[in-house]
Interface confidence: low
């Protein structure tokens, strides 16, 4: 079966050596290799020059790692940084909460725990499926990546389901239907992968999906010009009608004794079965 990388794996920056993998080329990261390792620009005014790229690599800035808590946004000042805090938070790093449980800060059915006085902080205990300090973020249930072999994860609310790519099946798309492993072709046939399902290339005289059916080599009427077909252990033999010759009686014999047969290879007389 063709190698199937993890669903969504970047075709430009990712590759795989096993089904379901997404391994990143240098300079890219993330589960799907879509995130550049450095978001720095060559126009960056700060920092030493990188020997490998020639770009300026930023040194640590005051806003690096976002020192502002509780969703505050950081902006650099000439000397340090400044946090713009969301409603209900204050302090240098937005670390002090002015919100209490009385304000109903927990979303999505989260349980608020904390004192009623203005100085006390609160904690939201989130229900399954939600996270964040206010239970405001829905957990991406498909982040568990349960679907193998590039299957698409579907969150149905009550359950996860995997929609498998062609050639794969199972609750996690873990079964490779193209896989010849463990699928024997009978009577000397060989397994060929591809096309969404394995198939058998059968030895002479056998047919069917697994080469279990004995094939009649004469069923297709292979002998031309009224020749009679005889099944033989090694294939078929044509007994040609008068005036015809060749393995399949395809060549007329000319009255003068010459034939329309192409020059025979060494050791093979015209009219001999060609196998």
């Amino acid at each position: 079966a063709p190698l199937v990388c993890r669903a969504g794996c970047s075709p430009e920056h990712g590759f795989c050596e096993q089904p379901g993998e997404c391994r990143c080329l240098e300079g890219w990261t993330g589960p799907l290799c879509t995130v550049p390792v450095s978001t720095s620009s060559c126009l960056s005014p700060r920092g030493p020059s990188s020997a490998t790229t020639g770009c300026l690599v930023p040194g640590p800035g005051p806003c690096d790692g976002n020192p502002c808590a509780n969703g505050g946004s950081c902006s650099e000042t000439p000397r340090s940084f400044e946090c713009t805090c969301p409603r209900g938070f204050y302090g240098l790093r937005c670390e002090v909460s002015g919100v209490t449980c009385a304000d109903g800060p927990c979303f999505n059915g989260g349980l608020c725990v904390g004192g009623a006085d203005p100085d006390s902080a609160y904690i939201c205990h989130c229900p399954p499926g939600f996270q964040g300090s206010n239970c405001e973020k829905r957990v991406d249930r498909c982040s568990l990546q349960p679907c193998r072999n590039g299957g698409l994860c579907l969150d149905l609310g009550h359950a996860l389901r995997c929609r498998c790519r062609a050639g794969f099946a199972g609750p996690r798309c873990e079964h490779d239907l193209d896989d010849c492993a463990g699928r024997a072709c009978a009577n000397g046939g060989t397994c060929v992968e591809g096309g969404g399902a394995h198939r058998c290339s059968c030895a002479l005289g056998f047919g069917g999906r697994d080469c279990r059916e004995r094939a009649d080599p004469c069923a297709a009427r292979p002998c031309a010009h009224g020749g009679r077909c005889y099944a033989h252990f090694s294939g078929l033999v044509c007994a040609c009608a008068p005036g015809y010759m060749g393995a399949r009686c395809e060549f007329p014999v000319h009255p003068d004794g010459a034939s329309a047969l192409p020059a025979a290879p060494p050791g093979l007389r015209p009219g001999d079965p060609q196998r």
């Epitope: 957990v139 249930r141 568990l144 199972g170 609750p171």
Partner: antibody, heavy 114, light 112 residues
Framework: QSLEESGGRLVTPGTPLTLTCTAS????????MIWVRQAPGKGLEWIGI?????STYYASWAKGRFTISRTSTTVDLKATSLTTEDTATYFC???????????WGPGTLVTVSS | DVVMTQTPSSVSAAVGGTVTINCQSS????????LAWYQQKPGQPPKLLIY???TLASGVPSRFKGSGSGTQFTLTISDLECDDAATYYC????????????FGGGTEVVVK
């Protein structure tokens, strides 16, 4: 493809310790990686996980006591302050999905004793 | 916290026999089927047997069978062989504020 844990040793209570899980034959950052421990004669105990997207999750008892971090070839388990109850063999394991971890390291023994 | 209870804690059976191990969870595993079974022999790491509650891991003989969903799961080992003597663990995945795993207490299988 294999995993090997290292860093286990005899330490005194209160000592911090870092265990390292090293991968051979594959890159760790496309898999979920868990840390599990097993006290002598006891069962398996899940410590935490770093998923393929880099997010970390911990057992409730392990939060604040252990930290998991990852590079493409190693996963570290940092213990802040060990107690005698942390004496165990520590395993790391690889999973393509959270419900099956198919490659395990042999384990590294941590003994905490005064 | 979730409690995963494995029963029995120890079971003994003859070669060629069948053993059944139960795993009960105090809350439903994620998606009702995020449950795995492992085999562990002394001095060795665990070995994955079954994942997705009933799917056989690569290379594991079909004598091992997993069943169940939600909070009740079963591992059945038929045609018992001497090599099956080991401790078996169930492992569930759960959804909470984030995600977490938990193991059952283990079941020791003795083959006579």
């Amino acid at each position: 493809q294999s995993l090997e844990e290292s860093g286990g040793r005899l330490v005194t209570p209160g000592t911090p310790l870092t265990l390292t899980c090293t991968a051979s034959g594959f890159s760790l950052n496309t898999y979920h990686m868990i840390w599990v421990r097993q006290a002598p004669g006891k069962g398996l105990e899940w410590i935490g996980i770093v998923d393929s997207g880099g997010s970390t999750y911990y057992a409730s008892w392990a939060k604040g006591r252990f930290t998991i971090s990852r590079t493409s070839t190693t996963v570290d388990l940092k213990a802040t302050s060990l107690t005698t109850e942390d004496t165990a063999t520590y395993f790391c394991a690889r999973g393509g999905s959270w419900d099956g971890f198919n490659i395990w390291g042999p384990g590294t023994l941590v003994t905490v004793s005064s | 916290d979730v409690v995963m209870t494995q029963t029995p804690s120890s079971v003994s059976a003859a070669v060629g026999g069948t053993v059944t191990i139960n795993c009960q969870s105090s809350q439903s595993v994620y998606n009702s089927d995020f449950l795995a079974w492992y085999q562990q022999k002394p001095g060795q790491p665990p070995k994955l047997l079954i994942y997705a509650a009933s799917t056989l891991a690569s290379g594991v003989p079909s004598r091992f069978k997993g069943s169940g969903s939600g909070t009740q799961f079963t591992l059945t080992i038929s045609d018992l062989e001497c090599d099956d003597a080991a401790t078996y663990y169930c492992q569930g995945t759960y959804e909470d504020v984030g995600w977490f795993n938990d193991f059952g207490g283990g079941t020791e299988v003795v083959v006579k």
